[in-house]
């Protein structure tokens, strides 16, 4: 629990860190370890994330052994006439889990994004609204038609495969990989998920990628020219590099992202393709993640309802007004 | 470019009100949210309160609650910052200056009052 | 909620200097760091503890912990002498210290 001791890692390599968790020297700066999240155990040993501007807090300085993961005081978050103090997390509706961090929201959806396979006992999958249930559930449609048809459209259209097509037989199995989902953040780093049965043993494995569909900074509105209502693809700037959880990557790239609408339309990635990026840490670890990197984008009215300000804005209006 | 400028020099007498709009320019004006900073002559930087451009929400330091009402135009993209029953400690310049984006993923955001008006010089003086 | 600052400090050219502001535990809050010259609006040099907004200079850099925040300015330059304020956020309320008149010699 403390530092008085020498260091003593395990011998496997680093962990794997959930996705948005900084791999961190432990306090003792012994061993890699997983950063504790806000409202998480904390002690000398088990640090809290600093990318996320988190700190242990023990309480009294009698009971310094373990403390709670708490984030800095910072900027409140004001909305619908409440007030939200840096730190604070609250529900927008039954579908957002939104926090404040120094003045600024970020929210995460609470239901499921999960994909499911057409299978034998259910070749047609289809997300419906449930009365009095929140979340769209997975229900089972008997086909109207002979016609197949594939899942729902999904955010991304085509990804530049290379390999097996996604619908071949091999080896007793039927190879079968769903589209990218759409990505989790509409701006900055998040992550798009795809189910696949594409290795050896056939069995359904869940793979993801990085994704930037825009950076939060570009105020991409005041790009549009007088007259039109999307800027699809803006010029694209000055290279970059990525940053993941204090990490930053090795290469700049000159990435192509997605614009805005002003007509209530969504723009979002059309064609995309899956590249490694390698990102070094500032205690030297390189650590390699598959990325998504845009092609061309789309305008359209595919967008989740505005039954909640909180969906309309990120997903419809991106930096939308609340009023 | 980013620019928020301010109504001009007021002079009034104690008790009465006065009213300092700032006009936003050059970003999404509800997308970020707007303070109201004040300094006395002489003196440093005090804070009055906020407001989210985009539902116009507010909140206000405990020292001007009752006293201070900011609203905004989204059609003008412009605050305004009302103060009541000035007296002569009110004489000072008062400053608007952009807040933080309401919503971005956390370590993209810039946290801060990253822009600021040129000020408005209010006179309290019998 | 109240945040210290040395009233003043004074450097020659090309020297590093530092300006602190404390606060009661303020190493638990973001802090901020505006300058500002005579006659002029503040600007944003420094913002949660240690990030600078893109146009500041590299020599500015920030650092909190603790009850105390620091603001360094590494080969000040001439254009460097301003008031310099700390800002600390408070149960939802901004304060700032009383400022820091920084000379260059």
């Known amino acids: 629990q403390n530092c008085s001791g020498p260091c003593r890692c395990p011998d496997e390599p680093a962990p794997r860190c959930p996705a948005g968790v900084s791999l961190v020297l432990d306090g003792c700066g012994c061993c890699r370890v997983c950063a504790k999240q806000l409202g998480e155990l904390c002690t000398e040993r088990d640090p809290c994330d600093p990318h996320k501007g988190l700190f242990c807090h023990f309480g009294s300085p009698a009971n310094r052994k373990i403390g709670v993961c708490t984030a800095k005081d910072g900027a409140p978050c004001i909305f619908g006439g409440t007030v939200y103090r840096s730190g604070e997390s609250f529900q927008s509706s039954c579908k957002y889990q939104c926090t404040c961090l120094d003045g600024a929201v970020g929210c995460m959806p609470l239901c499921s994004m999960d994909v499911r396979l057409p299978s034998p006992d259910c070749p047609f999958p289809r997300r419906v609204k449930l009365p009095g249930k929140c979340c769209e559930e997975w229900v089972c449609d008997e086909p109207k038609d002979q016609t197949v048809v594939g899942p729902a459209l999904a955010a991304y259209r085509l990804e530049d495969t290379f390999g097996p097509d996604p619908t071949m037989i091999r080896a007793n199995c039927l190879v079968q990989t769903t589209e990218w989902s759409a990505c989790s953040k509409t701006c900055g780093m998040g992550i798009s998920t795809r189910v696949t049965n594409d290795n050896a043993s056939c069995r359904l494995e869940k793979q993801s990628r990085l994704c930037m569909v825009r950076p939060c900074e570009a105020d991409l509105e005041e790009n549009i020219k007088k007259g039109k209502k999307c800027i699809r693809t803006p010029k694209i700037s000055k290279p970059i590099k990525f940053e993941l959880s204090g990490c930053t990557s090795m290469k700049t790239y000159r990435a192509k992202f997605c614009g805005v609408c002003t007509d209530g339309r969504c723009c979002t990635p059309h064609r995309t393709t899956t590249l490694p990026v390698e990102f070094k840490c500032p205690d030297g670890e390189v650590m390699k993640k598959n990325m998504m990197f845009i092609k061309t984008c789309a305008c359209h009215y595919n967008c989740p309802g505005d039954n909640d300000i909180f969906e309309s804005l990120y997903y419809r209006k991106m930096y939308g007004d609340m009023a | 470019e980013v620019h928020l400028v301010e109504s001009g020099a007021e002079v009034k007498k104690p008790g009465a009100s006065v009213k300092v709009s700032c006009k936003a320019s050059g970003y999404t004006f509800t997308s970020y949210y707007m303070h109201w900073v004040r300094q006395a002559p002489g003196q440093g930087l005090e804070w009055m309160g906020i407001?989210?451009?985009?539902?116009?929400?507010?909140s206000y330091a405990q020292k001007f609650q009752g006293r201070v009402t900011m609203t905004r135009d989204t059609s003008t993209s412009t605050v305004y910052m009302e103060l009541s029953s000035l007296r002569s400690e009110d004489t000072a310049v008062y400053y608007c200056?952009?807040?933080?984006?309401?919503?971005?993923?956390?370590?993209?955001?810039?946290?801060?009052?990253?822009?600021w008006g040129q000020g408005t010089t209010v006179t309290v003086s019998s | 909620y109240v945040l210290t600052q040395p009233p003043s400090v004074s450097v020659s050219p090309g020297q590093t200097v530092s300006i602190t502001c404390s606060g009661d535990?303020?190493?638990?809050?973001?802090a901020s760091w505006y300058q500002q010259r005579p006659g002029q609006s503040p600007i944003l040099v420094i913002y949660q503890d240690t990030k600078r907004p893109s146009g500041i200079p590299e020599r500015f850099s920030g650092s909190n912990s603790g009850n105390t925040a620091t603001l360094t300015i590494s080969g000040t330059q001439a254009m460097d002498e301003a008031d310099y304020y700390c800002?600390?956020?408070?149960?939802?309320?901004?304060?700032f210290g009383a400022g820091t008149q920084l000379t260059v010699l």
């Open positions: 407001i989210n451009p985009s539902g116009g929400s507010t």
């Open positions: 535990k303020l190493g638990n809050k973001y």
């Open positions: 800002q600390a956020w408070d149960s939802n309320t901004a304060f």
């Open positions: 200056a952009r807040g933080t984006r309401l919503y971005c993923s956390g370590g993209s955001c810039l946290n801060g009052m990253d822009v």
